[in-house]
Interface confidence: medium
């Protein structure tokens, strides 16, 4: 709390202008006035305040308005964002996609912090679901946001925003996330033609089911080891050997290197030995030639 | 963090000339602008001048005209050239960098404008 003081003669502030920096933080706190402040919050950004006098100048903002700052201020804030809580941000109301890109501007560069992850909240909350616009921002300026979502608030993301998302936005998904955004880039991408489909639906592909696989395996697509790697392994299972062949094309070589990993390790005990040996990879441990391979699964579901 | 180590100061009689530097390390790509401030004997602090990263100089009415501020981004170097020093200019100056998302500071130089 800044001890109130009167302002010395003659330095009362007529405007936020350069003049400011050489006030003592008890100077701003008696000589600027907040009304004054506020609506010129445009300039401060353009002034080279310390941190010191920030906090003076946020502290006349929040005495000017306790239930929170109006949008008319909020856009303007610059780098002052960097010193409000997140306590502060909730009392906000963002609608502007302009006001969000300003603050996210003043953060760049750094991770996200506490108080852009409230900004985000709020705004998307405001908006009710994360449209494409907001989505393209988002991911711009932080690349993992996508995947700091849960699956919950991934649901509200809609089909038309998933043209926004980058491969690399996927990257920390994991394939709960997944199983969420690959029905929605599935319908996203649905009027493309097979070979521009699949470099778009590729990075979706581990929230993919057996069916889908399937299906691309009918397409030529040549799915590298990478995105196969990254596949659930309840939809790899499934699949013969014949139609992993297809999906891989010349990648399935590929296969023998990641013999020991899943979903690979799993998938080649459900083969029989015969089938993998077509591939002339040397892959070992399928069922052995003879021997009679039970569904439980598809007996449960008879009984 | 940000580190900031001042030189150059020391005993100049008056209507001499001193450069100081301050070399700021660390995570320097943070730093939104910097200056010098400075603190004359029994005296509070008192901002001498600033430079933003873009270049944008600004003086305190007492040292127009006399001192010059300017930084060196390929050494990550700050300097104030002071001309014309007076016995009132007689001070310790500390660099001070406002940087993501906090103030840093020097440990200070100290400059004596004495016959």
């Known amino acids: 709390e800044v001890e109130k003081t009167a302002c010395p003669s003659g330095k009362k502030a007529r405007e936020i202008d350069e003049s400011l920096i050489f006030y003592k933080k008890w100077e701003l706190e008696a000589c600027v006035d907040a009304a004054l402040l506020a609506t010129q919050m445009d300039r401060v950004n353009a002034i080279p305040f310390t941190y010191e006098q920030l906090d003076v100048l946020k502290h006349k903002l929040d005495e000017l308005y306790p239930q929170g700052y109006p949008e008319s201020v909020i856009q303007h804030l610059g780098y002052l964002f960097l010193k409000m809580s997140p306590e502060d941000i909730r009392k906000w109301n963002v609608t502007s996609l302009e006001t969000l890109k300003a603050l996210l501007e003043v953060n760049k560069g750094h991770e996200m912090s506490p108080q852009v992850a409230t900004l985000i909240d709020r705004f998307v909350k405001g908006r009710g679901q994360l449209d494409k616009d907001t989505l393209d921002t988002l991911t711009a300026f932080y690349p993992g946001y996508l995947c700091s979502l849960s699956p919950e608030e991934l649901s509200s993301v809609p089909p038309s925003s998933i043209w926004a998302v980058r491969p690399q936005d996927l990257d920390t998904c994991d394939p709960r996330q997944l199983d969420v955004l690959y029905p929605k880039a599935r319908l996203a991408f649905q009027n493309m033609n097979g070979s521009e489909y699949f470099v778009k639906i590729q990075s979706f592909l581990g929230g993919a089911p057996t069916e889908d696989l399937k299906a691309l395996s009918q397409q030529n697509v040549s799915m590298d080891l990478a995105t196969f790697m990254k596949l659930r392994t309840d939809a790899v299972l499934p699949l013969t050997v014949a139609e992993v062949q297809k999906l891989l094309g010349p990648h399935v070589e590929g296969l023998k290197a990641e013999e020991r990993h899943r979903p690979v390790r799993d998938w080649i005990l459900r083969q029989r030995q015969d089938d993998l040996d077509t591939l002339g990879l040397g892959l070992q441990g399928g069922i052995p030639n003879g021997y009679l391979v039970l569904d439980l699964s598809m007996q449960e579901a008879l009984s | 963090e940000v580190q900031l180590v001042e030189s150059g100061g020391g005993l100049i009689q008056p209507g001499g000339s001193l450069r100081l530097s301050c070399a700021a390390s660390g995570n320097i790509g943070s730093i939104r602008h910097m200056g010098w401030v400075r603190q004359a004997p029994g005296k509070g602090l008192e901002w001498v001048s600033t430079?933003?990263?873009?270049?944008?100089?600004y003086y305190a009415n007492f040292v127009k005209g006399r001192f010059t501020i300017s930084r060196d981004n390929s050494k990550n170097t700050l300097y104030l050239q002071m001309n014309s020093l007076r016995a009132e200019d007689t001070a310790v100056y500390y660099c001070?960098?406002?940087?993501?998302?906090?103030?840093?500071w020097g440990q200070g130089t100290l400059v004596t404008v004495s016959s």
């Open positions: 001070r960098a406002t940087a993501h998302p906090t103030d840093y």
């Open positions: 430079i933003t990263t873009v270049g944008t100089t």
